[in-house]
């Protein structure tokens, strides 16, 4: 049997050591003990007695099925306890009585059906994070379960086999910053929602089939809910259940952010938010994020005209990796307050983008992200976006563009352009001179000779440049990142010719450690202030004698350098 390895500060690692019991020889010097991925099965009353100063105890996936009632009695300093993914089929309040300093407790993934006969947590007055439940057996949440807990930063409940929720069980916790609820179906959702309305600031609902969700008015008095964010992850919705979910919004008037992540919509987008009060109650929602939305019949999807009015005040929309090929012109025109739009990883092409960015579309838009779509012509893309009078930032990275023409038109206020990973080989005057930030990293550029009088930041890493670009091209440059190119040297003159340069990242290039380069780096200790990745990323490529040495450490041969 292997032994623990401990460092000088008392952090002890015993992960995956084939321990079949808590190892002997534990001492008061130990501050942190990790015994995860062992086969411990049993913790006796004396096993941890010596660890009076232990602050962190991690026992996840160690096959523990029995813990004696007083096993943790000496752990009054313990702040972090992880018992997740063991074989504990019942939980005992006597374990937690002595743990008055505990801030983090993870009991998730054990095969218990309830949280125990009596309240587990009345003494845990410092608890900030609690994770409970499992996939298969945790079936009941009761009123006694959370007694004594008044405020939590994070509460995660995996109740994917829930059969009974006792009304008001979660109501006793007055303040929960982030509640994550794993529910397989919506049966108890309304009851739970009523109980957390006045306490939860961020509600995350996971893996819930909401297809049968039906709203009914909540038995609550006028409540001022602090909920700011609502997220659905891995959930299933229908057109009808979406309409029903919208009715919940009348109870959360401060909601500012809604997120759908990895959800399935078994519908056609035929939404009908029937009640006009729902529209006004969406008034404070500023951010809508949709990622990986799966719509089995996406090719029959509606134009969403029924929800236009819902989104008029929204400022930030992300719809990522969801097979979007068109935002209808009339929809774009309704998005009057939209300042940020991210349509990354979709199916947009110039022809449909033209319809989306029609006259009057997205009148307040400042940032547009069209990364990883199916755009091919930079010239057409720029021309199509001329309608966006307030656009300052455009990301069209990860599209495979045809070679760049000599001239292009772009929105006149554009200051930021991301052309990274677009396969470009040459930069031409198609790139607008108004730019302050340009990202052309991860392309096939072997030179850069474009005059950009306002450019403050240039990102040109992962290309094939052999030298730093000429400083006269960028009179006001502050930041240049040119890692992973083929730059062989830089000199005092080169760096000095960038009058305003504050940050240069030029590591992982093929440096030829010549006498000039090495003497320059030795004589210029201030390099560390400009080269943010100095010294570890600056290695000699040649001569062979110095290959792999850091420039900082490499010493030129006296013979070579004083000939």
């Amino acid at each position: 049997q292997e032994s623990l390895s401990c460092d000088a500060s008392g952090v002890c690692d015993g992960r995956s050591r084939s321990f079949t019991s808590i190892p002997s020889g534990l001492t008061a010097a130990m501050k942190s003990l990790d015994l995860s991925f062992n086969k411990i099965t049993y913790i006796g009353h004396g096993d941890l007695r010596a660890c009076a100063n232990l602050q962190v105890l991690i026992l996840k996936s160690s096959r523990i099925n029995t813990i004696e009632g007083d096993a943790f009695y000496s752990l009054g300093s313990l702040e972090h306890l992880d018992l997740s993914d063991n074989h504990l089929s019942s939980l005992s309040s006597s374990w937690f009585g002595p743990l008055s300093s505990l801030k983090y407790l993870n009991l998730m993934g054990n095969p218990y059906q309830t949280l125990g006969v009596t309240s587990l947590f009345p003494n845990l007055t410092n608890l900030q994070t609690l994770r409970i439940g499992n996939v298969e057996t945790f079936s009941e949440i009761r009123r006694i379960d959370f007694a004594g807990l008044t405020s939590l930063n994070e509460l995660e409940i995996k109740a994917l086999s829930l059969r009974n929720y006792q009304s008001q069980s979660l109501k006793s916790i007055r303040d929960i910053h982030h509640l994550t609820l794993h529910l397989s179906e919506s049966a108890f959702l309304l009851e739970i929602f009523a109980d957390i309305l006045s306490s939860v600031r961020y509600l995350e609902l996971r893996d819930t089939n909401l297809a049968r969700f039906q709203f009914s008015p909540l038995p609550v008095d006028e409540v001022s809910s602090p909920m700011k964010k609502l997220a659905f992850r891995g959930s299933v919705l229908t057109d009808e259940s979406f309409n029903e979910l919208l009715k919940l919004l009348r109870y959360i008037l401060e909601l500012s952010e809604v997120e759908f992540d990895d959800c399935t919509l078994n519908g056609l987008g035929d939404f009908n938010p029937s009640e006009s009060d729902v529209v006004s109650e969406l008034g404070k929602v500023e951010t809508v994020t949709i990622r990986r939305l799966h719509i089995p019949q996406f090719y029959l999807f509606y134009d969403l005209s029924t929800v236009y009015s819902l989104l008029e005040k929204v400022k930030r929309i992300t719809v990522e990796n969801s097979k979007v090929f068109l935002v209808p012109c009339s929809f774009s025109q309704h998005l009057k307050s939209l300042e940020f739009l991210d349509l990354s990883e979709n199916l947009m092409v110039e022809e449909y983008l033209k319809n989306s960015a029609c006259k009057g579309a997205w009148p307040s838009l400042q940032t547009l992200v069209l990364s990883q779509n199916h755009l091919r012509s930079m010239q057409k893309t720029g021309e199509i976006l001329l309608t966006l009078k307030n656009l300052t930032s455009l990301d069209i990275s990860r599209n495979t563009f045809h070679p760049m023409p000599d001239s292009c038109q772009w929105p006149e206020k554009m200051r930021f352009l991301n052309l990274s990973s677009t396969g470009i080989r040459v930069v031409k005057t198609c790139i607008p001179q108004t730019l302050e930030v340009l990202d052309v990293s991860n392309n096939n550029l072997d030179s850069f000779s474009l005059f950009l009088p306002r450019l403050q930041e240039l990102y040109i890493s992962r290309n094939k440049l052999k030298t730093l670009p000429d400083a006269s091209l960028f009179p006001v440059l502050l930041v240049m990142k040119i890692r992973e190119n083929a730059v062989s040297t830089f000199s005092k003159d080169q760096l000095g010719s960038f009058p305003k340069l504050e940050t240069l990242e030029a590591g992982d290039n093929h440096f030829v450690c010549s006498c000039e380069l090495l003497s320059f780096t030795m004589e210029t200790p201030a390099l560390a202030q400009i080269l943010v990745d100095w010294p570890d990323s600056y290695l000699c490529d040649s001569p062979p004698r110095l290959h792999g040495h850091r420039l900082q450490d490499a010493r030129p041969s006296v013979l070579e350098c004083h000939q």
């Epitope: 298969e136 397989s184 179906e185 893996d207 819930t208 089939n209 297809a211 299933v236 990986r292």
Partner: nanobody, 122 residues
Framework: EVQLVESGGGLVQAGGSLRLSCAAS????????MGWFRQTPGKEREFVSV????????DYSSSVKGRFTISRDNAKNTVYLQMTSLEPEDTAVYYC???????????????WGQGTPVTVSS
């Protein structure tokens, strides 16, 4: 209607590996939650693992977590269970199931395969 057919079971030595497959026929495979369960003679069916519609969520029973990995290929209408570091206690008939709910409760699954036996010898 969904038909499920498991394969890949067999005899393996303790510490060895097996990969079970479950091929689904019928419509809308990608709309189903898929689960693996196992059963030994005289005992109730035991939850092993579950994967959601997209593959974005997975869960395991504590007895197999870290050793087994569930995955799915919606293009091939197939769900897999990669089993490593097998132990004699893993000996059972393994069943694949499809349902609408992401859960470890066997009664919430609508369709079941006929099972594939796994024997782990010491």
């Amino acid at each position: 209607e969904v038909q499920l057919v498991e394969s890949g079971g067999g005899l393996v030595q303790a510490g060895g590996s097996l990969r079970l497959s479950c091929a689904a026929s019928g419509r809308a495979f990608s709309s189903y939650v898929m689960g693996w369960f196992r059963q030994t003679p005289g005992k109730e069916r035991e939850f092993v693992s579950v994967i959601n519609w997209s593959g974005g969520s997975t869960d395991y029973s504590s007895s197999v977590k870290g050793r087994f990995t569930i995955s799915r290929d919606n293009a091939k209408n197939t769900v897999y269970l990669q089993m490593t570091s097998l132990e004699p206690e893993d000996t059972a008939v393994y069943y694949c199931a499809a349902g609408q709910y992401y859960t470890g409760r066997s009664d919430r699954y609508d369709y079941w395969g006929q099972g594939t036996p796994v024997t782990v010898s010491s």
